[in-house]
């Protein structure tokens, strides 16, 4: 807190300009009118105020707007944004994407701070859903943003927004998140032809059910092993050897290197050894010839 003192004669600020960088904190407090500051916020970023002087400017704005800053001020905060607490930001009503971009730019190159997380939360809640332009903006600044949302939050993402998602945006998503995103992606890309569709849907396949994988196996997609290894185990298990061979195409040879890892390991255990041998990869661990396979899960479902 800066104690209230009278402004020295001749030092009253008529405008926000560079002469103020030589003012002591108490002089800034006494000589700069908060309303003037609010109307000339766009000048603040062009002036090299010290970190301590920024504290005073924030204090003045806080006094002027105890219920939260108006967007006209927020969009010009610049580096002053880093002085804000999540509590300050919760009072704001940010509706403009340009304002959001301006503030994210300030934090560019750094990890998502509590301030930024609060800002994004306020913005998205204000919009009611995570629309394409917002998602585009957020993933451009924070590629991992999408995977930081809960499945419940992801359910508010409209399928049209999925077009903004890049493969790297999904790198840290877990299966529960992909379960939510996959149906949206399927819907978003449904009008694309086979090969183009596969390119777009590939990153989301960690949420795909068995029947969709079976359908893909009929389309000569040549799925790479990295994508196959991210598929849901429960979706892979019912696939036949022939279906996996068609799904992977020339990449099927990579199964040998992954035979001890899920989902390949679990899939091998479910296949007849005879069928595995047809691949010529030396995969071991299948069901020996002459054994009868009882699907107990099916049995339970029938009883």
């Amino acid at each position: 807190e800066v104690e209230k003192t009278a402004c020295p004669s001749g030092k009253k600020a008529r405008e926000i300009d560079e002469s103020l960088i030589f003012y002591k904190k108490w002089e800034l407090e006494a000589c700069v009118d908060a309303a003037l500051l609010a109307t000339q916020m766009d000048r603040v970023n062009a002036i090299p105020f010290t970190y301590e002087q920024l504290d005073v400017l924030k204090h003045k704005l806080d006094e002027l707007y105890p219920q939260g800053y108006p967007e006209s001020v927020i969009q010009h905060l610049g580096y002053l944004f880093l002085k804000m607490s999540p509590e300050d930001i919760r009072k704001w009503n940010v509706t403009s994407l340009e304002t959001l971009k301006a503030l994210l730019e300030v934090n560019k190159g750094h990890e998502m701070s509590p301030q930024v997380a609060t800002l994004i939360d306020r913005f998205v809640k204000g919009r009611g859903q995570l629309d394409k332009d917002t998602l585009d903006t957020l993933t451009a600044f924070y590629p991992g943003y999408l995977c930081s949302l809960s499945p419940e939050e992801l359910s508010s993402v409209p399928p049209s927004s999925i077009w903004a998602v890049r493969p790297q945006d999904l790198d840290t998503c877990d299966p529960r998140q992909l379960d939510v995103l996959y149906p949206k992606a399927r819907l978003a890309f449904q009008n694309m032809n086979g090969s183009e569709y596969f390119v777009k849907i590939q990153s989301f396949l960690g949420g795909a059910p068995t029947e969709d994988l079976k359908a893909l196996s009929q389309q000569n997609v040549s799925m790479d092993l990295a994508t196959f290894m991210k598929l849901r185990t429960d979706a892979v298990l019912p696939l036949t050897v022939a279906e996996v061979q068609k799904l992977l195409g020339p990449h099927v040879e990579g199964l040998k290197a992954e035979e001890r890892h899920r989902p390949v390991r679990d899939w091998i255990l479910r296949q007849r050894q005879d069928d595995l041998d047809t691949l010529g990869l030396g995969l071991q661990g299948g069901i020996p010839n002459g054994y009868l396979v009882l699907d107990l899960s099916m049995q339970e479902a029938l009883s």
């Epitope: 003012y23 002591k24 062009a46 090299p48 010290t50 970190y51 301590e52 580096y79």
Partner: nanobody
């Protein structure tokens, strides 16, 4: 407290150029504000140019349009590019981080400085 080492001064003819360098003890990318001061005759050091991570810059009136302050994070260096030098630019130049404000009285971390002499 940030310690600094300045270099790049020298003797140059009027109209010539020099580039001063300042290497801080810490990572320059995390130092919010840095500036260049100079001291000619007399005890007072005047702020020549200042810059903050927020993008704000300041140039004293006598050097506007001739001097440029900038950082290179990769080289961890603050520079002062001085073009079209004049005899009145002759001074000892110091790099510093400000205290509460940019007045020289508030700076505590002065380096040894680098001498610039401009002959006519």
């Amino acid at each position: 407290e940030v310690q600094v080492v300045e270099s790049g001064g020298g003797l140059v003819q009027a109209g010539g150029s020099l580039r001063l360098s300042c290497v801080p003890s810490g990572s320059i990318s995390s130092i919010y504000a840095m500036g260049w001061y100079r001291q000619a005759l007399g005890p007072e050091r005047e702020l020549v140019a200042a810059q903050t991570l927020g993008g704000g810059t300041y140039y004293a009136n006598p050097v506007k349009g001739r001097f440029t302050i900038y950082r290179d994070n990769d080289k961890n260096t603050l520079y002062l590019q001085m073009n079209n030098l004049k005899p009145e630019d002759t001074a000892m130049y110091y790099c510093a981080t400000p205290g509460e404000h940019w007045g020289s009285s508030d700076v505590t971390n002065w380096g040894q400085g680098t001498q610039v002499t401009v002959s006519s």
